[in-house]
Interface confidence: medium
């Protein structure tokens, strides 16, 4: 008996994995076990199937590959290397697949890969060469244009004895492979700081999402080189104030829109420059929603409604007069 056609353009097989580059390419109309395929849409979906490895028999036509909601654990080098290569694969979504390790060269041999989503994976071990593929000081340029790394921070007890921020940044900067990256999302990663060199080496960025982190200050971060930046998401961080240098850099970016909601702004004398800037600038979206969190007497006051008389600092007492 032959399979009957379905009204949907998706086909699938429903059988299971060992990893090897197959010498015999799959037939063009085949679909890997536990996946759904649409050749018309050039899409393969292997979603919520508890896969423990990337299917080896992916069809050569695949342009969009969804491997979300699985149990992949580790992406080895050449996880998507095939003969012939998956030359058309442009969008790869691996979110929520319990990945805790992405090894060097995991995305090698994907010449058209433009979008990669690794969100919601507890990446305790992200190789510095995960995206560049080699440890050369200058690697071949990656085709990646969008890199989505939201909520990839592992639980605290699973983190290596090193800075999580440093591990992620090392992968972003290795071999200068991501010079063409236009969108970078790093939301919800408990970042305490942003290493100062990261943005300078991603000159093509149009969209940067750092929302829902724990950033306290941007003092050592330079936005000067990001002349193409269109959106900067800094909502839901721990920012207390933006200082003059940062304000001037942001104002100097020709296309920028900045999002600053839900930060614990400290409305004391150090806030005066930022309040003045906010009143004049057009770059901050929803600036009328920004409110003070501290000191207590200023809580919930709207920043735009403050004047210099509101922004005072308690005098610093000499040590002999300070109370404990």
């Amino acid at each position: 008996s032959s399979p009957t056609s379905s009204a949907s353009s998706f086909s699938s097989s429903a059988p299971f994995l060992a990893s090897a580059v197959s010498a015999q390419p799959p037939l063009p109309d085949q679909c890997p076990a536990l996946c759904e395929c649409s050749e018309a849409a050039r899409t393969v979906k292997c979603v919520n199937r508890n896969l423990t490895e990337v299917p080896t028999d992916l069809p050569a036509y695949v342009r969009n590959l969804f491997l979300t909601g699985n149990q992949l654990a580790v992406l080895p080098a050449g996880a998507f290397a095939r003969r012939p290569p998956l030359a058309e694969l442009a969008a790869l979504n691996l979110s929520g697949s319990r990945l805790d390790e992405v090894r060097a060269g995991a995305f090698e041999h994907l010449p058209s890969l433009r979008q990669l989503d690794l969100s919601h994976n507890p990446l305790a071990d992200l190789s510095p060469f995960a995206f560049s593929g080699s440890n050369a000081s200058v690697s071949a340029p990656s085709p990646l244009v969008e890199l989505i790394l939201n909520h990839i921070v592992p639980p605290e007890d699973e983190r290596q004895n090193r800075s999580f921020e440093g591990m992620v940044v090392a992968a972003l900067l290795a071999g200068r492979a991501l010079q063409g990256l236009r969108r970078l999302e790093l939301a919800s990663n408990h970042f305490l700081y942003l290493p100062r060199d990261v943005l300078a080496q991603l000159p093509s960025l149009r969209h940067l999402d750092l929302s829902n982190n724990s950033l306290v200050s941007l003092t050592y971060v330079s936005f000067r080189n990001l002349t193409h930046l269109e959106s900067l998401h800094l909502e839901d961080n721990a920012l207390k104030v933006l200082h003059n240098g940062t304000l001037a850099e942001l104002q100097g970016l020709p296309h920028i829109r900045v999002f600053l909601d839900n930060n614990p702004w400290v409305c004391d004398c150090h806030m005066a420059d930022m309040v003045t800037w906010l009143k004049e600038t057009e770059v901050v979206q929803g600036k009328d929603r920004l409110t003070c969190a501290y000191p207590e007497k200023m809580r919930n006051r709207v920043l735009l409604e403050l004047n210099s008389a509101d922004l005072d600092c308690d005098p610093i007492l000499p040590p002999s007069l300070q109370t404990s």
Partner: antibody
Framework: EVQLVESGGGVVQPGRSLRLSCAAS????????MHWVRQAPGKGLEWVAY????????YYADSVKGRFTISRDNSKNTLYLQMNSLRAEDTAVYYC?????????????WGQGTTVTVSS | DIVMTQSPDSLAVSLGERATINCRAS??????????MHWYQQKPGQPPKLLIK???NLESGVPDRFSGSGSGTDFTLTISSLQAEDVAVYYC?????????FGGGTKVEIK
């Protein structure tokens, strides 16, 4: 006409090995994923193993993982199941079955089965 | 593993009457596009035979008195008018993930 014919069953002592074969005809064997399913005496069906059409992908039930190996020879239109370290609980009728190369459909053709008895 | 629970274990129905068999999966076996649930008939001394694929699609050559329905976790096989040749054990099976698992079977007899 699609035909699947299993062979290689028999009586074997615990800890020994056996190799089952499944000869396929009446369809393009190399286009189809293949399975082994077993049925213990008086019991229900238990899926055992799967191999993709080009032998690039294998899956096994936990109960046989590390002991059984599924393979195929597309040039001979034959599916195999190498069974090592056999146990009494492996006693069953073993069926080979075909699943379509694409589409989500179930096991559309089955062989008549071959009986494996593991007993000392 | 996904557990497939079939009910009832056995069923005695008069010739020409309706027989209904239920199968419940311990988690959803349907995507937004398909249901990965199939039904088989097994007569004594014979291998299983695919009756219904993907919840509701009748395999070619199967009489149209057989029908399947359901999605997510709950599925039903119905024989609208039981014939003598329908006496058999019926199994549901999912193909959502590894391992494929079968229900325990429902024995259908003539009352």
């Amino acid at each position: 006409e699609v035909q699947l014919v299993e062979s290689g069953g028999g009586v074997v002592q615990p800890g020994r090995s056996l190799r089952l074969s499944c000869a396929a005809s009446g369809f393009t064997f190399s286009n189809f994923g293949m399975h082994w399913v077993r049925q213990a005496p008086g019991k229900g069906l238990e899926w055992v193993a799967y191999i993709s059409s080009g032998s690039s992908t294998f899956y096994y039930a936990d109960s046989v993982k590390g002991r059984f190996t599924i393979s195929r020879d597309n040039s001979k239109n034959t599916l195999y199941l190498q069974m090592n370290s056999l146990r009494a609980e492996d006693t069953a009728v073993y069926y080979c079955a075909r699943s379509p190369a694409y589409y989500r459909y179930g096991l559309d053709y089955w062989g008549q089965g071959t009986t494996v008895t593991v007993s000392s | 593993d996904i557990v497939m629970t079939q009910s009832p274990d056995s069923l005695a129905v008069s010739l020409g009457e309706r027989a209904t068999i239920n199968c419940r999966a311990s988690q959803s076996v349907s995507s937004s596009t398909f249901s990965y649930m199939h039904w088989y008939q097994q007569k004594p001394g014979q291998p299983p035979k695919l009756l219904i694929k993907s919840s509701s699609n009748l395999e070619s050559g199967v009489p149209d008195r057989f029908s399947g329905s359901g999605s997510g976790t709950d599925f039903t096989l119905t024989i609208s008018s039981l014939q003598a040749e329908d006496v058999a054990v019926y199994y549901c099976q999912h193909s959502w993930e590894i391992p494929y698992t079968f229900g325990g079977g429902t024995k259908v007899e003539i009352k």
